[in-house]
């Protein structure tokens, strides 16, 4: 069932006071505004789903047009530590310390967090990004350096009255943003402590969270435009699924991409695409307002239940898996990218998959919530869909187990 | 406006390397594949590989894949291509592009003379 | 990998006239090919996408068209600063190929 529980203290309908807090867009990330320190320093900071530190660009570099500066803060506290997180591409290092942290679109509270301050890094910041730092919100277990450094959200429950539990509402454009455009747009809501029932149509279906680390789901089954993929179901979670809003693209484990493209490019066979295409390499354009995004098929993700033998699914159009992308050299047409992508690491569940929905994150319930968002880009034919209840046979089969080895190599 | 800045001249010996650069501006770098292609008199354009910025996965060539290496530095917002154990044959003018559809934007030219 | 053949080396045209450049595809590339413009000493300059669409800013004087496995690259009323070679490339599958070039001289 969608579990629609009596409103609790907490989980009122509205908070209309951090609806529409994020900014940002699905390419360079979604970021919330936050307070650091003591007077209070202002940074944007990247909402990322993935990963479990907090941690701040702390020194001058290139990309950021700011920085915590802990010298001016009169509540930072060194704790004589330093972090190091290499990604499998480019990495960032810091000093590890605490402060005093809020978020002014948030819960009228403040919280003394670990910080990692950020000296050095490498293909971590983004050029005009206009974020500062990251959010990172899963799970100690993946925590660097290592689950004794308590994420931000623990602290945040554990300090104050704050439900454990937060949602995110992340609105794709559904078409190109220039720099003014980004910073003048809404990106979208991260709710935290609760759900804003204005941020979605339907009803919310919930998916346990398998282990907590990073969100891990299970999917169970795949379809392209309703035709199942048939696959071993193990082969969609090899070696885990995740939901990341700091991953741009819905990323597949090699096997489910192939199988999943090959589908795509039969149901869109009308037009020839190039293989770069495919690849995410050439971009593909129509005359503006032309999009034909009905040769394109819908991509379906049923997801394990809460319920035994019970499962839902959601569904995305090609309006969330085709990113908009703005050139110059062809700016008198609508283009776009590939944004399913192929991945070595499990499925990631990123923006691609997110902005089509609301989802909610409830850590005290150990589950993932799904809803149509009220601001995903759709078409008058096909809208983004959550649906059920289906009958699905041995889902637990569908997890697979990592061997047991250090998981402290995490390489994003 | 978009541009792509390529290194100046080299002149190597046979049996040295090289190491090209190709620097960007006017776009989001990491939003747009790099491609490096050869060209030598009468033997028009070849295309040797190519890099994504986001994360440096990289195409080849099968031809030119063990003379090749492409790599970037996003920091800079540049790419590298790094040509090994070269011979006359790889004597040529060598250009980065930009991908978007096609190759809408080039590199003003690198000339490479390899050379005793 | 797919051979893209200009068959002509060289042609001839005159300041005001209509010229069509040719370029055959070994096999189905569908309409994923683009045309270049590239004058002595400098680098190549797009011109053609999608076997029809003009990049920003390129006179419309240029017009591509073709598709499957024969295009055409047509400049009306040509100017004297179109003296220049013509590659055409398929970008449909790796490995990308060009044509091997038509140099159009003015008379």
């Known amino acids: 069932e969608t579990d629609e529980e009596p409103e609790e203290p907490g989980r009122r309908g509205s908070f209309v006071e951090m609806v529409d807090n994020l900014r940002g867009k699905s390419g360079q990330g979604y970021y919330v505004e936050m307070t650091v320190g003591s007077p209070p320093q202002t940074l944007n900071i990247l909402v990322d789903t993935g990963s479990s530190n907090f941690a701040v660009g702390a020194a001058p570099h290139p990309f950021l047009h700011r920085y915590y500066q802990r010298q001016l803060s009169s509540t930072y506290r060194d704790l004589r530590k330093g972090v190091y997180v290499p990604y499998t591409q480019g990495k960032w290092e810091g000093e590890l310390g605490t402060d005093l942290v809020s978020i002014p679109h948030g819960p009228n509270v403040t919280v003394r967090a670990n910080i990692a301050a950020i000296t050095e890094s490498d293909k971590f910041f983004i050029n005009g990004s206009n974020w500062e730092g990251i959010l990172g919100l899963a799970y100690a277990e993946i925590a660097r350096p290592d689950d004794s450094l308590e994420p931000f959200f623990d602290s945040l429950v554990k300090q104050t009255h704050v439900p454990n539990l937060f949602s995110l509402q992340l609105c794709g454009a559904g078409f190109p943003l220039n720099q003014s455009e980004v910073l003048a747009s809404v990106g979208g809501s991260m709710i935290i402590g609760g759900i804003d029932h204005s941020l979605y149509t339907g009803s919310l279906w919930y998916t346990p969270i398998r282990r907590e680390w990073y969100y891990e789901v299970i999917i169970v089954r795949v379809e392209i435009n309703g035709q199942d993929l048939k696959m071993d179901c193990k082969e969609y979670n090899y070696d885990k699924s995740i939901v990341d809003s700091g991953t741009t693209n819905l990323r597949l484990p090699k096997k489910v991409f192939e199988a999943a493209v090959k589908s795509i490019k039969a149901a869109s066979s009308t037009e020839k695409f190039p293989d770069g295409f495919w690849l995410g390499e050439q971009l593909v354009c129509w005359q503006a307002g032309t999009t034909p995004w009905n040769i394109f098929p819908v991509i379906s993700l049923y997801l394990m239940g809460e319920v035994t033998n019970q499962s839902f699914r959601i569904t995305i159009l090609p309006q969330q898996y085709l990113r908009p992308v703005e050139d110059v050299a062809t700016s008198q047409d609508d283009c776009y990218k590939f944004a399913i992508s192929q991945s070595s690491t499990g499925t990631v569940m990123g923006a691609v998959i997110m902005e089509g929905f609301y989802v909610v994150f409830d850590r005290a319930r150990k589950r993932i919530g799904f809803a149509v968002s009220a601001c995903h880009v759709h078409d008058e034919f096909r809208t983004a869909a959550v649906e059920g209840p289906f009958v699905t046979l041995d889902m637990e089969d569908c997890g697979y187990n990592i061997p047991q080895t250090d998981e402290s190599t995490l390489m994003t | 406006e978009v541009q792509l800045q390529q290194s100046g001249p080299e002149l190597v010996k046979p049996g040295a390397s090289v190491k090209l650069s190709c620097k960007a501006s006017?776009?989001?770098?990491?939003n747009f594949w790099i491609h490096w292609l050869k060209q030598r008199p009468g033997q028009g354009l070849e295309w040797?590989?190519?890099?994504?910025?986001?994360?440096?996965?990289?195409k080849y060539n099968q031809k030119f894949k063990a003379k090749a290496t492409l790599t970037v530095d996003t920091s800079s917002s540049t790419t590298y291509m790094h040509l090994s154990s070269l011979t006359s044959e790889d004597s040529a003018v060598y250009y980065c592009a930009r991908s978007g559809v096609a190759f809408p934007y080039w590199g003003q030219r690198t000339l490479v003379t390899v050379s005793a | 990998d797919i051979v893209m053949t200009q068959s002509q080396k060289f042609m001839s045209t005159s300041v005001g006239d209509r010229v069509s450049v040719t370029c055959k595809a070994s096999?189905?590339?569908?309409?994923?090919v683009a045309w270049y413009q590239q004058k002595p000493g400098q680098s190549p300059k797009a011109l053609i996408y999608?076997?029809?669409h003009r990049y920003s800013g390129v006179p419309d004087r240029f017009t591509g068209s073709g598709s499957g496995t024969d295009f055409t690259l047509t400049i009306s009323n040509v100017q004297s600063e179109d003296l220049a070679e013509y590659f055409c490339q398929q970008y449909n599958s790796y490995m990308y190929t060009f044509g091997g070039g038509t140099k159009l001289e003015i008379k």
């Open positions: 096999q189905n590339v569908g309409t994923n």
């Open positions: 040797i590989g190519m890099i994504d910025p986001s994360d440096s996965y990289t």
């Open positions: 999608s076997a029809s």
């Open positions: 006017g776009y989001t770098f990491t």
